[in-house]
């Protein structure tokens, strides 16, 4: 799917739009809000009843090159006694983000937008149980 | 997309860093992944820290629709189906990259933007302190 053109009738394409070759788009990768610091809840990944670990993936041909992925530590959830309860499930919560992929073809380079699915953390769910005949 | 030379052995050798502005193919790789979390799983209902999903729409952004999670309760659902307020439902937040039309309303000119989204909720056991 292509990125949708501005199709709303109340939008007028401004005269100031930069010229772009067909089939391409101009992308400024100087990130808006790059330096915005997020006050995430500390240690939520350790204090959760469905705790998780983080792994950093690194790819020099991706922008951003660093993407952090979470993995649930347990199959079950941690109960009030600190023991794993396998009648409940720790499951990953995922979110899509965009990255820019650099592709090398011989002596030339092209850029491609890519959707990446990031595992953000885990939550504890009641499993749906089916009894198989 | 538009191509530019690269090293080694290629003329006009290129920096390892990404250039500030790039020309990108309009087609997005992996575009068919499901963007509606209500359809992709029912974890938001079955979690011990359930959440509601709110649609955030902005035509100047790609993707134009982003789903934001809001925890349904302050506490977590216990085995009896009641809210246990000795535990916390806490949003799991993630910074994601989106495209912002720049200049505004331009069909094929964008800038990357970092936004913070609440993706879901998790149940947390808080450390308790008694204030003297």
């Amino acid at each position: 799917r292509k990125i949708p053109k501005v199709g709303h009738t109340f939008f007028q394409k401004p005269e100031s739009c930069p010229p772009v070759p067909g089939g391409s788009m101009k992308l400024d990768i100087g990130i808006i809000n790059e330096n915005q610091r997020v006050s995430m809840s500390r240690n939520i990944e350790s204090r959760s009843t469905s705790p998780w670990n983080y792994t950093v993936t690194w790819d020099p041909n991706r922008y951003p090159s660093e993407v952090v992925q979470a993995q649930c530590r347990n199959l079950g959830c941690i109960n009030a006694q600190g023991k794993e309860d396998i009648s409940m499930n720790s499951v990953p919560i995922q979110q899509e983000t965009l990255v820019v992929r650099r592709k090398h073809q011989g002596c030339s380079v092209s850029f491609q937008l890519e959707k990446v699915l990031v595992t953000v953390g885990c939550t504890c769910v009641t499993p749906v149980i089916h009894h198989v005949q | 997309g538009i191509t530019i030379p690269r090293n080694p052995g290629c003329p006009n050798s290129e920096d390892k860093n990404f250039p500030r502005t790039v020309m990108v193919n309009l087609n997005i790789h992996n575009r068919n992944t499901n963007t509606n979390p209500k359809r992709s799983s029912d974890y938001y209902n079955r979690s011990t820290s359930p959440w509601n999903l709110h649609r955030n729409e902005d035509p100047e952004r790609y993707p134009s629709v982003i789903w934001e999670a809001k925890c349904r309760h302050l506490g977590c659902i216990n085995a009896d189906g009641n809210v246990d307020y000795h535990m916390n439902s806490v949003p799991i937040q993630q910074e994601i990259l989106v495209l912002r039309r720049e200049p505004p309303h331009c069909p094929n000119s964008f800038r990357l933007e970092k936004i913070l989204v609440s993706v879901g909720c998790t149940c947390v056991t808080p450390i308790v302190h008694h204030v003297a």
């Epitope: 006050s39 809840s41 500390r42 | 925890c71 302050l74 806490v90 947390v124 808080p126």
Partner: nanobody
Framework: EVQLVESGGGSVQPGGSLRLSCAAS????????FGWFRQTPGKEREFVAG????????EYANSVKGRFTISRDNSKNTVYLQMDSLRPEDTAVYYC?????????WGQGTLVTVSS
């Protein structure tokens, strides 16, 4: 360190009203929710009311719904509990709770007595 200052407790007749307040100071940033529990002798502390800081979403125990109202003043890091139509069974020590998601602070408590 976080400090919690509770006030507003006291004695009142059935049907009367009281307003509790709890002010947080110190390193009380990244508040998840702020609220009140209560405890009567020989019983466990029970949740009364809470207000989520990010969006002012409120939650109440069934026993106080429609009678108690929780509100907040963001600028003062203060939470209020307006208690109307008080009943003898509302007699308890009311504890302020400041929740920072992974850490929770309990106040020392303020006594509310409802009797004729």
């Amino acid at each position: 360190e976080v400090q919690l200052v509770e006030s507003g407790g006291g004695s009142v007749q059935p049907g009367g009203s009281l307003r509790l307040s709890c002010a947080a100071s110190g390193r009380a940033n990244s508040i998840n929710w702020f609220g009140w529990f209560r405890q009567t002798p020989g019983k466990e502390r029970e949740f009364v009311a809470g207000i989520r800081w990010s969006d002012a979403y409120t939650e109440y125990a069934n026993s106080v719904k429609g009678r108690f109202t929780i509100s907040r003043d963001n600028s003062k890091n203060t939470v209020y509990l307006q208690m109307d139509s008080l009943r003898p069974e509302d007699t308890a020590v009311y504890y302020c709770v400041l929740d920072l998601s992974t850490v929770r602070y309990w106040g020392q408590g303020t006594l509310v007595t409802v009797s004729s």
